[in-house]
């Protein structure tokens, strides 16, 4: 470790006297830092010796020798004060720039360490400090304002009391820079916008900064718009806002339009669009199937999808028949607005009854005019089965009818014994039924179908069951013929 | 809900000294300057000094230096105050009010106490 | 120290109308576009209560009917419209530099 003469760690002089500072080290030695033109420098062997004729105030500082070769990066310091009566103060740099939160040295050096017990921070012309300023002094250093915040950019003088007056150092100019997180926060207003020919529309884009130095334009397509902006300072952030106002737009006024702000961290854009039309319109859409088909009991939900400008003006949900003059509820209907000009509107059909079938539609009006849009709602029903014993052209027949939707398929099964219902170790015989015949096929009801099943002679010991199936389920009737004519079994529930 | 409880009323005599104390419940304690300030009928709001509860660091006004002491209890997040040598000039209602520590530079009292009133008097 | 001074010392406003009471400073409590001057609300037998801080920030739970504006040397409270509850007196305070000040407080009443 190198070694200074004379010793320090401080070295009091009075301006005029000569001043030798010698660093002597195992190896080469030198001095950091760059030394002003007032001080002789040269080499003496393995030390370096730094020397001047007429100390000055403004030789006030720390010197600091390091020996280079040295592994431990070792390095010897000697302060040296030079006691100007008149300039109690040296200032080793009129600008001081920091980021928010740090520590901020404001470099004036005491040039009299008498006088650290009056030395004070004040802001230029003996302001006093900002409130809740928290600073330290040094006197190898000068004053050191802890964790700077962005409002105590000063200009600022240290002051020190000399006989019984305050005596002012030159100013130091703290500049604290904001943190800059990123590029400016942006919104851009509406998301979109839809404007018939001939109405006002106003676009505004603003952006928003930690600092004031950054940047913001609207761009239409590809054309950067000239716009005067409006600035303002709030919750500690700079806003910048562009107001486009047209008066009647037109189709030119169409198009992309794009806010852009940028600082030094970079650049935030956001987008929107802008649809200019000749007259007021109104779509009704669904991603529905508008013919549906719900099992008897379960529900279902309509769904209908609105673009509309201008606004809607009314809406409902209608029961058009054909069974009751029911009309929903209205606590069943529910609209959610996706953005500005889209609408979705449900209806909720819980649990449906049979008198629930048909058809319902969403009627909307705009000053386009209305729209309507009609879903039709068929119920699905498991099929109903019955049997009866007759004659027809003279001959035993068995008629089953069978009542379902979708319309029922029938199968005639023939087992032996006497049973409810005829399992598949009794079977005899199968018959299936290709084109039972059509009784009735009502628009939203059952379809009714007859099925025949011709029989010469019955046996007695067996027993015929129709069976009826669609897509909901299955339903079934058992026939026993007996010697005073015949009986009939629904199948057991 | 935040609160700043006073210590109740004080009658005391001249020459005497008072310490009234300030409760912070629902608040970090040491986010917030704890703040004095004087009313009294005749000089409206007067600003005493504060304290910052992190490392009991005291700003005074000068007018009140000599008379007011401010200590803080962080363990019971209690601000106090004293008044020393007590005359009929410091008959008035005593308010502890918070002011925020942050990076933000606004420092405005955004709690105050219910006020504790002391009357000088022989 | 900073001296506030503020004007006038009472008033009396209608129900619904304006009110507009003013803070000026001794020097300017300005700095890199902060203004840091703030309004309280006093009833009586009650505390102040912060409404507006740095000049025209809404403290939280505060109406809309409260407003703030000024720069530098002048500053302004706006109540509109005014209502019943808003009788108290009103005052400006200063955190720029120690020691903080206040104004000598406006008188609010409401015809």
């Known amino acids: 470790i190198p070694v200074i003469e004379p010793s320090g760690p401080e070295l009091v002089v009075k301006p005029g006297e000569t001043v030798t500072l010698r660093c002597v080290g195992n190896g080469s030695v030198e001095w950091d830092g760059p030394i002003s033109p007032h001080w002789t420098l040269y080499s003496d062997g393995p030390s370096s010796v730094l020397t001047t004729n007429n100390a000055t105030f403004q030789n006030t500082r720390t010197y600091r020798c390091t020996e280079p070769g040295d592994p431990l990066g070792g390095s010897a310091a000697i302060h040296l004060y030079v006691k100007d009566p008149a300039r109690p103060w040296n200032v080793l740099a009129k600008e001081v720039v920091v980021f928010e939160d740090q520590d901020a040295l404001l470099p004036c050096l005491l040039t009299d360490p008498v006088l650290e017990a009056g030395v004070s921070l004040v802001r230029l012309r003996g302001r006093p400090l900002l409130r809740h300023t928290n600073y330290s002094f040094s006197p190898w250093h000068g004053f050191i304002i802890h964790r700077a915040k962005f409002i105590q950019g000063q200009d600022y003088q240290c002051s020190a009391l000399m006989g019984g007056r305050k005596v002012m150092s030159i100013s130091i100019r703290l500049k604290v820079q904001k943190v800059i997180p990123g590029p400016p926060a942006l919104t851009l207003v509406p998301a979109e916008l839809v404007r018939i020919r001939g109405e006002a529309a106003q676009i505004v884009c603003s952006a928003s900064n930690i600092d004031v130095d950054f940047d913001v334009f609207l761009q239409h397509n590809t054309t950067k718009l000239a716009i005067p902006q409006r600035s303002d300072f709030h919750d500690n952030r700079y806003q910048k806002v562009l107001t486009l106002s047209l008066g009647q737009v037109d189709f030119q006024h169409a198009g992309n339009y794009s806010c852009v702000a940028s600082n030094v961290q970079g650049k935030h854009s956001t987008s929107m669009f802008f649809q200019v039309v000749e007259s007021a319109y109104l779509d009704l859409s669904s991603e529905q199937n508008l013919i549906q088909e719900v099992t008897v009991g379960e529900g279902l939900n309509l769904k209908v999808m609105v673009e509309a400008y201008p606004g809607l003006q009314g809406f409902n949900w209608t029961y058009l028949g054909p069974f009751s003059d029911h009309q929903p509820e209205p606590k069943l209907a529910n609209a959610t607005t996706k953005d500005t000009y889209r609408h979705t509107f449900t209806l909720s059909l819980p649990r449906l009854k049979p008198s629930e079938a048909g058809r319902y539609s969403f009627l909307a009006r705009n000053p386009g005019g209305w729209r309507a849009l009609t879903f039709e709602l068929t119920l699905r029903y498991p099929p109903e089965v019955s049997v009866i014993w007759t004659s027809i052209n003279g001959s035993g027949t068995l008629l089953c009818a069978a009542s379902g939707y979708p319309q029922p398929n029938v199968t005639w099964l023939q087992c032996a014994g006497h049973t409810d219902r005829c399992d598949e170790a009794q079977v005899l015989q199968v018959w299936v039924d290709p084109h039972p015949e059509v009784l009735s096929q009502e628009p939203f009801q059952k379809v009714t179908v007859q099925s025949l099943l011709t029989a010469e002679t019955l046996e007695h010991n067996q027993t015929y069951e129709c069976r009826a199936h669609n897509s909901v389920g299955s339903g079934s009737w058992a026939f026993i013929p007996i010697s005073a004519g015949a009986r009939t079994h629904p199948p057991d529930e | 809900e935040v609160q700043l409880q006073q210590s109740g009323p004080e009658l005391v005599k001249p020459g005497a000294s008072v310490k009234i104390s300030c409760k912070a419940s629902?608040?970090?304690?040491?986010?917030?300057?704890m703040n004095w300030v004087k009313q009294s009928p005749g000089k409206g709001l007067e600003w005493i000094g504060d304290?910052?509860?992190?490392?009991?660091?005291?700003t005074y006004n000068q007018k009140f230096k000599g008379k007011a002491t401010l200590t803080v209890d962080k363990s019971s997040t209690t601000a106090y105050m004293e008044l020393r040598s007590l005359t009929s000039e410091d008959s008035a209602v005593y308010y502890c009010?918070?002011?925020?520590?942050?990076?933000?530079?606004?420092?405005?009292?955004?709690?105050w106490g219910q006020g504790t009133s002391v009357t000088v008097s022989s | 120290d900073i001296v506030l001074t503020q004007s006038p010392a009472s008033l009396a406003v209608s129900l619904g109308q304006r009110a507009t009471i003013s803070c000026r400073a001794s020097e300017s409590v300005s700095s890199h576009d902060i203004h840091l001057m703030h309004w309280y609300q006093q009833k009586p037998g009650q505390s102040p209560k912060l409404l507006i801080y740095?000049?025209?920030n809404l403290e939280s739970g505060v109406p809309a009917r409260f407003s703030g504006s000024g720069s530098a040397t002048d500053f302004t409270l706006n109540i509109h419209p005014v209502e019943e509850e808003d009788a108290a007196t009103y005052f400006c305070?200063?955190?720029?530099?120690?020691?903080?000040?206040f104004g000598g407080g406006t008188k609010l009443e409401i015809k």
């Open positions: 629902a608040i970090t304690f040491t986010d917030y300057y």
């Open positions: 305070q200063q955190s720029i530099e120690d020691p903080p000040t």
């Open positions: 740095a000049a025209s």
């Open positions: 304290i910052n509860p992190n490392n009991g660091g005291t």
């Open positions: 009010a918070r002011e925020k520590i942050s990076m933000e530079y606004y420092y405005a009292m955004d709690y």
